[in-house]
Amino acid sequence: FPQDRPFEDTCHGNPSHYYDKAVRRCCYRCPMGLFPTQQCPQRPTDCRKQCEPDYYLDEADRCTACVTCSRDDLVEKTPCAWNSSRVCECRPGMFCSTSAVNSCARCFFHSVCPAGMIVKFPGTAQKNTVCEPASPGVSPACASPENCKEPSSGTIPQAKPTPVSPATSSASTMPVRGGTRLAQEAASKLTRAPDSPSSVGRPSSDPGLSPTQPCPEGSGDCRKQCEPDYYLDEAGRCTACVSCSRDDLVEKTPCAWNSSRTCECRPGMICATSATNSCARCVPYPICAAETVTKPQDMAEKDTTFEAPPLGTQPDCNPTPENGEAPASTSPTQSLLVDSQASKTLPIPTSAPVALSSTGK
């Protein structure tokens, strides 16, 4: 059988590299806590931090929550990847009137071209339907002079879009097509309730945005306002506030017009993996097993990991968590490999079993 030794010798003595017999190459060994971005890393830049599920690594190397497309009027355009957020767009038959980072803060149904007008460009997830007169010149069959007059700006006239509230958008899934009164009526029933904090029915230069208060005459104090559960970020974009809906999180500060909601771990838990405005992973205050000591200090660690305490020392353990729940097993079971989210490297003595991961997977 062929021997790999001659190839293996090319990385011999270099602890930062290893020889991969499968690809017959020396590869760079990513340091602990970092994961490879290719099968045979060649340099440190081929190693990255790994985030929890539904989080991605942003440009600043922070684990950031992927946006959710759970609203009825949104669909997933691209999934949450290790280095990019999930991207949401308005569902078919709707377009985005107020964009948000990687999502849309407000979707409207595509307009129905009024009588005497025909579709020039069909609506997309980003743009409303564009209408044009059915024949050159002004058609006498126009429903109203407003829809028929030539636009002074040279733009193509559009019918008024129908807003959809996230809460009611599931009420109609029928596509609004043609110029039928039925379709228009069905769409018009999906407007927001009068008490909804949206800009529907208010004059506004930017659909979906409104002043935070009535503007005094001549005053410039009219801020752009985002939809509920969105805030205005430093770049002036409407950005989704993080959600604290996970069982292990509680709200620390609410979602405000200019700042995100912030979440923290509920009492009795500590944050093992931080994320922007939240915590990607909360773990119970560790309870030390006999002859082991937990190390929860490193915020980058993905799992509570165990190691034998130094000789002659007492384990420095936290008491039972405030909620009184004890872990399923206080003595760690020996685990061959660190959990796929883990980033801790530990020696495994052959004499005493030591768990690399407390997840029990």
Epitope: M32, P36, Q39, W82, V338
Partner: nanobody, 123 residues
Framework: EVQLVESGGGLVQPGGSLRLSCAAS????????MGWFRQAPGKGREWVAR????????YYADSVKGRFTISQDNSKNTLYLQMNSLRAEDTAVYDC????????????????WGQGTLVTVSS
């Protein structure tokens, strides 16, 4: 130093079964993926199967799908390959490897290797 030691190889008749084991000891380096490779006489090394140990996801080469099963026993620090319906073309030295899942992919690095165990399928 990490040690991966394979066992369970041997001579078996076509249609028979074998179970290979790979015992790990020493310093496992943030590994979250283990796999089996094989190398037949005069041929290149071929990937057989792998398991992502955190999620338990398993992947198989087309040539062994439905016949081989990869599994792990964390309590014994051991990886297994159950081989059923063996064929003459499965004759090879079988190696186990440990490494890490590549971000955004289902492939793994192969940072640690065993010395291999010989499986011969012959009547």
């Amino acid at each position: 130093e990490v040690q991966l030691v394979e066992s369970g190889g041997g001579l078996v008749q076509p249609g028979g079964s074998l179970r290979l084991s790979c015992a790990a000891s020493g310093y496992i380096y943030s590994s979250n993926c283990m796999g089996w490779f094989r190398q037949a006489p005069g041929k290149g090394r071929e990937w057989v199967a792998r398991i992502h140990t955190g999620s338990g996801s398993t992947y198989y080469a087309d040539s062994v799908k439905g016949r081989f099963t990869i599994s792990q026993d964390n309590s014994k620090n051991t990886l297994y390959l159950q081989m059923n319906s063996l064929r003459a073309e499965d004759t090879a030295v079988y190696d186990c490897a440990a490494g890490r899942v590549v971000l955004g992919a289902v492939v793994c690095t192969n940072e640690y290797w065993g010395q291999g165990t010989l499986v011969t399928v012959s009547s």
